[in-house]
C-alpha cells in the first residue's frame, strides 16, 4: 500500500514565438485544475482506457483574468499535492498522464464550461521510497513543470511497498505468517500476497491468493469464529495450525472498490459505496459536488449535482476563494481614510480615527470648513479641531457676521487720526510721523529711520498708506 504524489510547480506558455498569452478564451476569466491518471506498464494505451492504478483531481486554482499588455505569466495554480493511493504493490513501471483543464467562468448557460487545455503522457520507471523526480514537459504551446514520487504507507517498505516493516515498539517476534528478514531484525518480510482482505490476525497463506485460517477461525477471509476446532475440506496441517481452503472467489473478493469504497455483493455482481469525494462505479475517480460540502465558512453551494456539473461557492461577506476558504483581508483595501487605523473584527470593519476626524471611515474632518462659510468675505482657516474665520476688515465675530469699527482699537500711532474706509482704514499721521499706522518717526535732519524712503516721497510729507 502507498501513495503516488504529484506536485505541479508551474504551468504557462512555453518559450518561443506564438506562445499563448492567456489560458482563458475571449469569453472572460477562467481557472485551471489538473487531473492525474496512472496506468500500469509502459505500453501505449488509449487515452480513454481506465486509470487502473488510480486517478485524482486537483482543487480549482485561483481565478485568472488576462491583463492586456502585461507579460504572459506563469498561471495561478491550485494549492497542494495531487495524491493517488494504491492498495497493492507499486508496479515500478507506469504511465503518468497529466491533464490541464480550463473552467471558464463567463456567463455560460448552465454554469461554467470545461475544456481540456493540455495533456502530457510520460512512461516511467520509478521505485517507491525514492526521492522526488522532477520533469518539464511541453504540450502544444504550453509548458508544465512538475515533480512526482511514490511512497509506501501502512508499515509497507521496499521499492514495491510489498515488504512489511514491524515498528520498533512491537514485540521482537514477527507476527503470524511473517518471517524475520535478514539482516535487519527490525523488519519482517511479507510472505506470498494472501487473498485481499484475509484477516491479519487469524489468517495466513503459503501460496499467493490463499487465505488459510488459524485454529478457531473460519470463513473465506478467516473472520468468522469457528464453532468447532476443525474445518471441512482440510488440506492438511500447516506448520502453525490446521488450515482450511477457501471457497471460490466472491464478487467482492480482492475488494474491487478503490479509494476506501466498501463492497457489497449483489446477485452475480457487486456494488461499491464510495466515501465522500470519490465517484465512479468503483470509486476510482475523485471529484467534488455540492453533496461533498465543498464550500467553507458558510458559503452557499450552487450547481454540482454530480462532478460533471461544476459547483460554485457563493461566499459570505469576509471570505473569498473558490471554496470560500480564504478570509478576506478587508483592511488591505485601506478603507479608513485620513490615516485612520483599520480593525477587521470578523463580523464588521471598524476604523479608529485620528484626532480631528470622524465617521465610519474617518471621512469627516472635524475642522472641515465646508458648510461653515465665513460671512462678509472672511476666509475659513482649518486647525485645532475647530474651524476659525479670518475676517475682512470691518467685520468680526466667529463667522464674521458682526460689523466692526476698524478705528475702535485706535490703530494709528503717535496721534494719527483714523478714518474708516470701504477696504479698511486710513491713518492721517501727525507731523513728524509716517507709515500705514504712523509708526515711523521722521527725523528733523531730513533722514528717515527707514532704510530708504519710498520713491516719490519727501520726508515731512503727510503719509497716506492704504
Amino acid at each position: 500500500a502507498g501513495v503516488f504524489e504529484l506536485q505541479i510547480h508551474s504551468f504557462g506558455p512555453g518559450p518561443g514565438p506564438g506562445a499563448p498569452r492567456s489560458p482563458c478564451s475571449a469569453r472572460g476569466p477562467c481557472r485551471l485544475f489538473f487531473r492525474v491518471c496512472l496506468k500500469p506498464g509502459l505500453s501505449e494505451e488509449a487515452a480513454e482506457s481506465p486509470c487502473a492504478l488510480g486517478a485524482a483531481l486537483s482543487a480549482r486554482g485561483p481565478v485568472y483574468t488576462e491583463q492586456p499588455e502585461a507579460p504572459a505569466p506563469d498561471l495561478p495554480l491550485p494549492n497542494g499535492l495531487l495524491q493517488v493511493p494504491f492498495r497493492d504493490a507499486w508496479p515500478g513501471t507506469f504511465s503518468l498522464i497529466i491533464e490541464t483543464w480550463r473552467e471558464e467562468l463567463g456567463d455560460q448557460i448552465g454554469g461554467p464550461a470545461w475544456s481540456l487545455l493540455a495533456r502530457v503522457t510520460r512512461r516511467r520507471r520509478l521505485a517507491a521510497g525514492g526521492p522526488w523526480a522532477r520533469d518539464i514537459q511541453r504540450a502544444g504551446a504550453w509548458e508544465l513543470r512538475f515533480s512526482y514520487r511514490a511512497r509506501c504507507e501502512l508499515l509497507a517498505v521496499g521499492t514495491a511497498c510489498t515488504r512489511l516493516c514491524r515498528p520498533r515498539s512491537a514485540p521482537s517476534r514477527c507476527g503470524p505468517g511473517l518471517r524475520p528478514c535478514a539482516p535487519l531484525e527490525d523488519e519482517c518480510e511479507a510472505p506470498p500476497v494472501c487473498r485481499a482482505g484475509c484477516s491479519l490476525e487469524h489468517g495466513f497463506c503459503e501460496q499467493p491468493g490463499e487465505c488459510r485460517c488459524l485454529e478457531g477461525w473460519t470463513g473465506p477471509l478467516c473472520t468468522v469464529p469457528a464453532s468447532t476446532s476443525s474445518c471441512l475440506g482440510l488440506r492438511g496441517p500447516s506448520s502453525a495450525t490446521t488450515g482450511c481452503l477457501v471457497p471460490g472467489p466472491g464478487p467482492c473478493d480482492g475488494n474491487p472498490c478503490a479509494n476506501g469504497g466498501s463492497c457489497s455483493e449483489t446477485p452475480g455482481s457487486f456494488e461499491c459505496t464510495c466515501p465522500r469525494g470519490f465517484y465512479g462505479l468503483r470509486c476510482e475517480v475523485s471529484g467534488v459536488t455540492c453533496a461533498d460540502g465543498p464550500c467553507f465558512n458558510g458559503g452557499l453551494c450552487v450547481g454540482g449535482a454530480d462532478p460533471d456539473s461544476a459547483y460554485i461557492c457563493h461566499c459570505p461577506p469576509g471570505f473569498q476563494g473558490s471554496n470560500c476558504e480564504k478570509r478576506v483581508d478587508r483592511c488591505s483595501l485601506q478603507p479608513c481614510r485620513n490615516g485612520g487605523l483599520c480593525l477587521d473584527l470578523g463580523h464588521a470593519l471598524r476604523c479608529r480615527c485620528r484626532a480631528g476626524f470622524a465617521g465610519p471611515r474617518c471621512e469627516h474632518n472635524l475642522d472641515d470648513c465646508a458648510g461653515r462659510a465665513c460671512a462678509n468675505g472672511g476666509t475659513c482657516v482649518e486647525g485645532g479641531g475647530a474651524h476659525r474665520c479670518s475676517c475682512a476688515l470691518g467685520f468680526g465675530g466667529r463667522d464674521c457676521r458682526e460689523r466692526a469699527d476698524p478705528c475702535a482699537a485706535r490703530p494709528c500711532a503717535h496721534g494719527g487720526r483714523c478714518y474708516a474706509h470701504f477696504s479698511g482704514l486710513v491713518c492721517a499721521c501727525a507731523p513728524g510721523y509716517m507709515g500705514s499706522r504712523c509708526e515711523f518717526p521722521v527725523h528733523p535732519d531730513g533722514v528717515s529711520a527707514l532704510p530708504a524712503a519710498p520713491p516719490g516721497l519727501r520726508p515731512g510729507d503727510p503719509q497716506r498708506y492704504l
Epitope: R35, C51, W114, C272, C274, Y279, L281, C283, V285, D306
Partner: nanobody, 127 residues
Framework: QVRLVESGGGSVQVGGSLRLSCAAS?????????MGWFRQAPGKEREGVAA????????SYADSVKGRFTISQDNAKNTVYLQMNSLKPEDTAMYYC???????????????????WGQGTQVTVSS
C-alpha cells in the same frame, strides 16, 4: 455542464434497424460516466432502454429490448451508440441520451439517477 447531442433518429419500417448516436462533451469524468438511453412515447412515462458504464464492464437493458438493442461506445469520440434491430411499432418514441457520474452503485435504468440530458431524437416505426 455536460452537453449531450443525439442523432440518428428517423422513420423506419417494422423489422428495420436504426443506430442512434449520443455525442458527449469531454470532461475529466468522461471515462467514469453512466450513459443511458431513455424513451418516451406520446402519453406515456419516460422509460429506460439501455445503459453502460464508460469505464467498461457494465451494461444493462430493459426486458422489452433485450436481444434486439445493443448499447456500445467509442471512447475516442466520446460517443455512445444504441443499435436498434428488429424494430416494432411499440418502439416509436422520442429517444433521449442521459449521463451521470455515479457514486458507486450501478448504471441503472432509473431516470431519477441521471443529471444530464440531451434534447432527444425521434424514432418512428411504421407498419
Amino acid at each position: 455542464q455536460v452537453r449531450l447531442v443525439e442523432s440518428g433518429g428517423g422513420s423506419v419500417q417494422v423489422g428495420g434497424s436504426l443506430r442512434l448516436s449520443c455525442a458527449a462533451s469531454r470532461s475529466p469524468y468522461s471515462s467514469s460516466r453512466c450513459m443511458g438511453w431513455f424513451r418516451q412515447a406520446p402519453g406515456k412515462e419516460r422509460e429506460g432502454v439501455a445503459a453502460l458504464y464508460t469505464g467498461g464492464g457494465s451494461t444493462s437493458y430493459a426486458d422489452s429490448v433485450k436481444g434486439r438493442f445493443t448499447i456500445s461506445q467509442d471512447n475516442a469520440k466520446n460517443t455512445v451508440y444504441l443499435q436498434m434491430n428488429s424494430l416494432k411499432p411499440e418502439d416509436t418514441a422520442m429517444y433521449y441520451c442521459a449521463a451521470v457520474v455515479p457514486r458507486g452503485g450501478s448504471c441503472r435504468l432509473d431516470e431519477r439517477g441521471y443529471y444530464h440530458w440531451g434534447q432527444g431524437t425521434q424514432v418512428t416505426v411504421s407498419s
